[in-house]
Amino acid sequence: RKIPKVGHTFFQKPESCPPVPGGSMKLDIGIINENQRVSMSRNIESRSTSPWNYTVTWDPNRYPSEVVQAQCRNLGCINAQGKEDISMNSVPIQQETLVVRRKHQGCSVSFQLEKVLVTVGCTCVTPVIHHVQ
Amino acid sequence: GITIPRNPGCPNSEDKNFPRTVMVNLNIHNRNTNTNPKRSSDYYNRSTSPWNLHRNEDPERYPSVIWEAKCRHLGCINADGNVDYHMNSVPIQQEILVLRREPPHCPNSFRLEKILVSVGCTCVTPIVHHVA
């Protein structure tokens, strides 16, 4: 999947664009909005009818190295009595994000953009029931 | 920066941390090419906290299209299919990384940007604060 070139007619390539070797792109990894803390939607994960836990995955060859993933606590959903109702399903809600992957080939290092799928939380859904003939 | 294990036979000049600017391959490595959540699942309709998906488009960003969730109700759908206002449908917000064209309009020069997106909705029991 390649990053699309700017296709709009009003997007002419400015003279100020940095020269970039063919087949690659220049990426500044000083993050815009980095002053924002990386954090999760804390405090709803336990109050949800489809509660979830968080785990942190760590990879030193990935930027950012820390990615937080949610996991649904139950297969079913929590009812008004606080019990699991297995007639409903807790399902993960997922979102893609970009990371930079560092690859070592011998002594040389290359960088690759990668899309990763992050589970951000869970929601309670009515199950789809397939009737087997 | 991030410290990484290094091949002991390599020259010491290599930085242990990610450099500020890198040249990356134009091909994005991924197995998840479906960016329209309407096609990937129907949870947005089947959830007890259903949501609508709104298209957020920005040609100076990659990906240029991001679908954002907006909860349909303040309450949640109960077993009878009615909205129960004793519960709350709440958007789940997540910070994600995208690419921002920098300088603007340049085809192959980007900067990472952290943005806040609404991914879906979940049904929660409200905390009621009684204001004196």
Epitope: R37, S39, M40, S41, I44 | H54, N88, S89, V90, P91
Partner: nanobody
Framework: EVQLVESGGGLVQAGGSLRLSCAAD????????MTWFRQVPGKEREFVAH????????YYANSVKGRFTIARDDAKSTVYLQMNSLKPEDTAVYYC????????????????WGQGTQVTVSS
């Protein structure tokens, strides 16, 4: 139905400060992100600041970054907008809104608004 009541607006000299408050009903407040917008007559409502629920950091419009601070007090069901180093171009009606999803800086994503409070900055 959601009730939002803004207060704290007024007339202030350039360089001065004001603190706006937006009180919500407790059931709604603790569960949702809250956002301030502003509007000048004849113009679109403009995003000012967004404070998501709980541990997320706030987001600000570039025009107010470093001058305005959004904060919330869940116990009082109130969101505040501290406005420092005010400029004449900050003159507007300021509205708070409950975030129920969509793109947080787009006014059409919001269904629940306060009545607004007028801020006038004189030079």
């Amino acid at each position: 139905e959601v009730q939002l009541v803004e207060s704290g607006g007024g007339l202030v000299q350039a360089g001065g400060s004001l603190r706006l408050s937006c009180a919500a009903d407790g059931r709604t407040f603790s569960t949702y992100g809250m956002t301030w917008f502003r509007q000048v007559p004849g113009k679109e409502r403009e995003f000012v600041a967004h404070i998501p629920r709980s541990t997320y950091s706030p987001y600000y419009a570039n025009s107010v970054k470093g001058r305005f601070t959004i904060a919330r007090d869940d116990a009082k069901s109130t969101v505040y907008l501290q406005m420092n180093s005010l400029k004449p171009e900050d003159t507007a009606v300021y509205y708070c809104a409950v975030f129920t999803g969509g793109t947080y800086y787009v006014p059409t994503a919001y269904d629940y608004w306060g009545q607004g409070t007028q801020v006038t900055v004189s030079s």
